[in-house]
Each structure stands twice: as C-alpha cells, then as structure tokens.
Interface confidence: low
C-alpha cells in the first residue's frame, strides 16, 4: 500500500479550498497541527483542520446531502405535481361540460323548467366538484337534493301547469311525495350508484396523487442526523485535512455510508412500491361506471329519461299528489 | 336580473359532439402516468446508489478515500468505512425512521388500503337491483362501448369520451358556483366539446 503523501507543509491548499466554503481564514491553521480536539476527522499525524473547520464541514456535508436528495427526486416530484394539477383541472372541465350538457338538455327539451332547473343543476355540479376535492358531502344526499328540487318545478310546470299562483307553496309536500311515491322510478338510485362509484374513485385517485407529492416533499426536506453528518464529513471532507484535495471516496464505502444515512428513508420503499402498484390497479379499473368522465357526461341523458318516466305516469301521479298535498295547497308560507 | 342566461338558446341541429378518434383521453393520460410512475418504483431502494453516483466517487482512479486513509480502489480496505469504533453503522440503522418518515409511512399504508378497497372487480357494470323497475330507456349492456346515448329530441350525442383538455378556455357555464352569479356569456350557439 502506498504511503500517504506528506501533508502540505503550510496548509496553503487547504486554506484556499476552505476559503470558498467560508470566507475569512481564521479557522485554518498556518501549518499542520496535532488536532487533538478533532472529533470526526481523527488525525493519524499532523492535520490542517481545526474543530471549527470540522463543524463547518459537517454543516456543508448535510446541506450537500439535502441538495442531492432534492435533485434525485426532482423529476419524480415534477411528474406527480404536474399530473395532479392536470387531472384536477381536467376533472373540473368534465364537471363543467357535464353541467353544460345537462343545462342544454333542459333548455331544449324542457324550457318551462328553466330557469329553476339551472340553479339545481348548478348546485349539484358544484357539490360534485367539492366532493372530488375532498369535501365531506354525501353523494346520495346530492342526488336526492337534485330530484327533490326538480320535482316541485316539474309538477307545477309540466304535470299541472294550471295550478293557481296561491298554490305554488306546496314545495315541501312535493319534495316528500317525490320519495314516498318514487315518482322518478329507480332513476335516482341508478344515478346514485353510478355517480358515487365514479366520484369515489376519482376522489381517491386525486388524494393518492396528492399524497405522492407529500411523500416526496417529506423525504425531500429530511434533516439528516448528526451521526449521518459525521459519516458524510468523514467521507467527503476528512481527506482535505491531510492535504488530499483531489482524492475521491471509494465507491463501496460511499454505498455503506449512504445506506446508513438513509436507513429510515429506504423503509418507505416497500410502501412506495405498493402505492404505485395499487394506483395502477385503481387506474385499470377506472372505466364505465367507475369512470367519472363516462358517468357525468352521460348524466343529462339519464336525467332526461327520468323526467320522461314522470311524464309517462303523470295522470296517476297528479291524482295521488292532488289528494296528498291538498291541505298544503291552501296554506301559504309567504 | 341577469342571474339566468335567457339568451342561451341552443340549436338542436348542432347539438352533436364530433366523433374524434385517437384523441388523448383522460384514461390514456392516466395510463401514461402509471407507466411513468412505474419507472420510479424502485426510487427509494435505489436512492443510496443514486446519490453515490451523483456525488464525487472514485471511478477510474487507482486510489480512493475510505474515511481514514488513501487505499487502492479494489482493496479490502476500500469498502471498510473507517469508522470502526467511532460510529456504529448498525446502531444508526437500528434507530428506525424519523417521526416524519413514520408518519408518511402510515399515510401510505392508509392510502394503499383505500386504493386496494377501491380497485373494483371487473364484473357487471350495474348492480342487479337497479333493473327492478324495467327502465324503458334500456340499461347499458356489459359489452356496450358507452352508457351515455341520448333519447328524445335535441339530445346531445356524446359518442366518445371528452377529448382530454380539449380547450381549457371553453366555458358555457350557466351558473357560477361557488360564487354563483350565474351570468353566462355563451361563446357559441352550440355545445360541442370539440372545437377546431
């Protein structure tokens, strides 16, 4: 084994390197010293390092490590951040188009239900957006509210347009009758199933992407322990103390140090792998009623069918509701 | 009040969404994301190696630094860490992850559980009990390409899925949630997802 080269007799090289790290030369000895106070770069002979230099090296080593970690994850982080934003925006666009389709359907097929229907449709799709973004709204409630709101308008405008003005405050009775008499058949239940399944999947997909960002951010900004800082210092900087400015760490040694420093981070690996595979499984299942694009863009059609169902049974329903809500029609809540 | 857009009259004849083949859809974009993510599946286990390969390490030099002294690159001492008595690497590993890492592992476990729960069996599209009332409109069959056809005059025929991010600017909002002024300014007299 070759003997180590003699240390720089004047510590000049060390000083010029250290000056780049820390302007002001107070901490670098003029000539090699015993270095008995050193705790990391334990000298085998005279050294060009002081305790203060060692501390600075430790700080720099930890900063280097943090930067390396951040550059390692940059591409992955950008991939997830960009996609999370793109999908969130895309889902909002789908919701907006679905709302436009539904409003257009009312405008074309049931103009007498507008403008009220626009408001109910608007609130429904607002809640859809909020749900996707994580709001704790119940999908069944959303759908029930849509049909509860629509039915009084359908009843007074389509089924029974001759109702006098004084009778228009039977809203509450009609809302109740909507459920009790199942006036829309099983369409609300169909919509509930489709909407809740597709929105749940969409919501968890976005949640998963946002958690992916959180995972990267967490490991990106990890503060490394003092022990790790010492190991890194010893690997990257202790050679300088002996005037060995150009020498690099051994590859195997670097791997051992990094595994030590990253023991905690590497524990994420198992769950990270599972995360990607589970996300893949979810994505593979996102079609038909598990695909919000498919479901929401087709809602206008199902709502149209549900109104046709009511119209088909209008005669029977009008008689039943006439009796059921008779007392409500005399009451005025103005 | 301009709350409702009374000028939003849509010509029934143009309520057709163009059939566009080979467009990038949300589902193709999702699959593309997964493929890219899969290339990062070993990200965490590969980190130590990645960082070593991106920091100064002796590759072609004969001599390298092992933490204590200059040694030949392929000698036994090269892999030894030169910390024999000072820092016990095993101890460092035994400490376990930082609290923030443990926390994020718990969150990953939770989302993985949710993702597994949500990954559906590829069975029937609709629940059987939805067929009870005999819809006249015809339910979607399992082999159908889509479940969003139209019925009645002036229905919008949506042949394939929304072209992915076809036009971010296009907006025919009839209401303005969450602020809700509901002032619409239709940019066209048709509702078409696909503008050229």
């Amino acid at each position: 084994q070759p003997p180590p080269p003699p240390p720089d007799a004047t510590c000049h090289q060390v000083r010029s390197f250290f000056q780049r790290l820390q302007p002001g030369l107070k901490w670098v000895p003029e000539t090699p010293v015993p270095g008995s106070d050193l705790q990391v770069c334990l000298p085998k002979g005279p050294t060009c390092c002081s305790r203060k230099m060692e501390e600075k090296y430790q700080l720099t080593a930890r900063l280097n490590m943090e930067q390396l970690l951040q550059s390692a994850s940059m591409e992955l982080k950008f991939l997830i951040i960009q996609n999370a934003a793109v999908f969130q925006e895309a889902f909002e666009i789908v919701v907006r188009h679905a709302k436009n389709y539904t409003n257009a359907m009312f405008k074309n097929n049931y103009p007498s239900l507008t403008p009220q229907a626009f408001e109910f449709v608007g609130e429904f799709f607002t809640d859809v957006s909020l749900y996707i973004l994580g709001s704790d709204i119940n999908v069944d409630d959303m759908v029930n509210e849509l049909f509860d709101s629509l039915f009084p308008v359908i009843y007074t405008q389509l089924m029974n347009p001759g109702l006098p003005d004084s009778a228009l405050d039977i809203n509450e009775c009609l809302r109740g009758a909507r459920r009790d008499l199942k006036v829309f058949g099983n369409f609300p239940k169909l919509i509930m199933t489709q909407v809740s399944k597709s929105l749940q999947v969409t919501r968890i997909f976005l949640q998963a992407l946002n958690l992916g960002i959180e995972v990267i951010n967490t490991t990106d900004h990890l503060k490394f322990s003092k022990d790790c800082g010492r190991m890194l210092t010893r690997m990257w900087y202790c050679s300088y103390c002996q005037g060995l400015m150009m020498v690099k760490p051994c590859g195997g040694y670097c791997n051992v140090v990094m595994q030590g420093c990253m023991a905690g981070v590497v524990e994420i690996d198992k769950y990270w792998r599972e995360y990607i595979l589970s996300l893949e499984e979810l994505v593979n299942g996102m079609y038909r009623i598990y695909d919000m694009e498919n479901v929401l863009l087709g809602l206008f059609s199902t709502i149209h069918d549900s109104i046709q169902y009511v119209q088909k049974n209008a005669g029977k329903l009008t008689t039943t509701i006439g009796k059921l809500c008779a007392h409500s029609q005399q009451r005025q809540y103005r | 009040s301009a709350y409702y857009p009374e000028d939003l009259f849509i010509d029934k004849k143009v309520l057709k969404v163009a059939h566009v083949e080979h467009e990038e859809t949300l589902s193709s974009r999702r699959r593309e994301l997964i493929q890219k993510l899969k290339s990062f599946i070993s990200f965490y286990s590969a980190l130590p190696g990645y960082i070593c390969s991106h920091s100064p390490v002796a590759e072609n030099d004969t001599l390298c630094w092992n933490g204590q002294e200059l040694v030949e690159r392929y000698s036994q001492k090269a892999a030894r860490n030169g910390m024999k008595n000072q820092f016990n690497l095993h101890e460092l590993k035994m400490k376990g992850p930082e609290p923030v890492v443990s926390q994020i592992i718990d969150k990953l476990k939770h989302i993985n559980q949710l993702l597994r729960t949500m990954s559906m069996p590829k069975g029937r599209v609709l629940d059987k009990n939805l067929d009870e009332e005999g819809f006249e409109s015809g339910d979607c069959g399992d082999d159908e390409d889509e479940c969003i056809g139209g019925s009645g005059d002036g229905m919008i025929k949506v042949k394939n899925q929304l072209r992915f991010l076809a036009e971010l600017a296009y907006d025919l909002d009839v209401d303005d949630a969450p602020g809700n002024s509901q002032q619409a300014t239709p940019k066209d007299n048709e509702i078409s997802t696909f503008h050229n």
Epitope: E92, E123, I137, D141, S149 | D173, P178, G179, N180, Q183
Partner: antibody, heavy 121, light 112 residues
Framework: EVQLVESGGDSVKPGGSLKLSCAAS????????MSWVRQTPDKRLEWVAT????????YYQDSVKGRFTISRDNAKNTLYLQMSSLKSEDTAIYYC??????????????WGQGTTLTVSS | DIVMTQAAPSVPVMPGESVSISCRSS???????????LYWFLQRPGQSPQLLIY???NLASGVPDRFSGSGSGTAFTLRISRVEAEDVGVYYC?????????FGAGTKLELK
C-alpha cells in the same frame, strides 16, 4: 318585505349551551340558502355556518366545527343555530343572513337585526 | 383561508367630497367564468350590515349610484362620490369565492 328576526341570545358560562332561532318572513324561506354571521366585540364580522335551501348541506367555520349545528325547519320558516361547549371567544352579536338564491354559494343579501350572546364566568 | 385586508381603519371625509376605500385579498377572487366574488357591505351605527356591491362592481338594489366598486383579482376599491351624512358607518369587504367565507376588518367612514 323580507324580515329576519333572531332570538335566543343570552349570557352563559363557558362550556354551556344555547340555541339561537331566526324567524323568516316576506319570502319563500324554503327556496333560499341561509347563514349565521357573528360580530365580535371588536366589531369584526366572522362567518359561522351556512345551510342550503333544502337543508341537505351544511358548512362551518373551523373554530365552531363539532360544537355548533346549523339547521332549518322550512315548514316553520325558521333557521337555528345550536351551540354547545361555548367559549369566551364565541361572545358576539349573531346575525341571521339570507343568501341571494337557493344555493349555499350565493351571496348574502338580507341581514337580521342580530341577537347577543355573552359567554363569561 | 383567504385573508381579506382593509389597511385603513378609518377615513375622514368632508360632506360632498369623494372618497375611496380599499381592500385586498390574499388570493385572486376571479372565478374561472369571469366573475369576481368580492362584496361590499355598509354597517351604519346601531344597524345591521347591508349589501352595497355584489361581484365587485354591481350595485345592489336600492343603493344610490354614488357608490361604485372596481378592482382586479386581488385589489379592490369602493368609491363614494359626493359623500352624504347617511353614508357614515363601517364598510366591510367580503369574499364569497370559497369557504370559509371571510371579511375584512372594516373601514370607518367619518365626516370631518
């Protein structure tokens, strides 16, 4: 004429409970979203809670979540705010406010005269 | 949460003069379809707040046209031309873009 009349304000000890009511008239109550807004002693206005026209959806300020419950009885044209685990920082004038339309996302257009809640030991 | 800032706690003005009251939001209140969800309320002494301006620049019914609202996505101004004695009170701005709904601290209009 739209009228909103709040009642139920009182002095209570910290940890106590109270229910505020708001009687609405002059409009079809069931068609409008409603909110409670409070004004603290330093004259700051603070949104407390919102309920939509049908009563299906409710929204709360973080500081009152789990302690306050907004509800409505459309048959009685009345809005309620059930308050429990009261704290001194809940001391304020509580206003009942109507939204411009049925959605919880419409802006405030009418305010009641307010009812005062004092929480002190 | 969106923070609404009204920097001036009070503004003194002579009757008949014009005055501007400003308000800032920590996030743009411009909705994707072009509406800006900023509202102005006036609370006269001993009274409840009343709506003056909705969606940044629209005058609420019954409000004199001496009042006007303007602004960008995050900086807003309420202007009163020819101030009258009945305009005295505290002016609050409020955002209704997203929950939680938030108000500014208020600006008191005082007559000199």
């Amino acid at each position: 004429e739209v009228q909103l009349v709040e009642s139920g304000g009182d002095s209570v000890k910290p940890g106590g409970s109270l229910k505020l009511s708001c009687a609405a008239s002059g409009f079809t109550f069931s068609s409008y979203g409603m909110s409670w807004v409070r004004q603290t002693p330093d004259k700051r206005l603070e949104w407390v809670a919102t309920i939509n026209s049908g009563g299906s959806y409710t929204y709360y300020q973080d500081s009152v979540k789990g302690r306050f419950t907004i509800s409505r009885d459309n048959a009685k044209n009345t809005l309620y705010l059930q308050m429990s685990s009261l704290k001194s920082e809940d001391t304020a004038i509580y206003y009942c406010v109507r939204h411009h339309y049925g959605s919880s996302y419409d802006y405030f257009d009418y305010w009641g005269q307010g009812t005062t809640l004092t929480v002190s030991s | 949460d969106i923070v609404m800032t009204q920097a001036a706690p009070s503004v003194p003005v002579m009757p008949g003069e014009s005055v501007s009251i400003s308000c800032r939001s920590s996030k743009s209140l411009l909705h994707s379809n072009g509406n800006t969800h900023l509202y102005w309320f006036l609370q006269r002494p001993g009274q409840s707040p009343q709506l003056l301006i909705y969606r940044m620049s629209n005058l609420a019914s019954g409000v004199p046209d001496r009042f006007s609202g303007s602004g960008s996505g995050t900086a807003f101004t309420l202007r009163i031309s020819r101030v009258e004695a009945e305009d005295v009170g505290v002016y609050y701005c409020m955002q209704h873009l997203e929950y939680p709904l938030t108000f500014g601290a208020g600006t008191k209009l005082e007559l000199k």
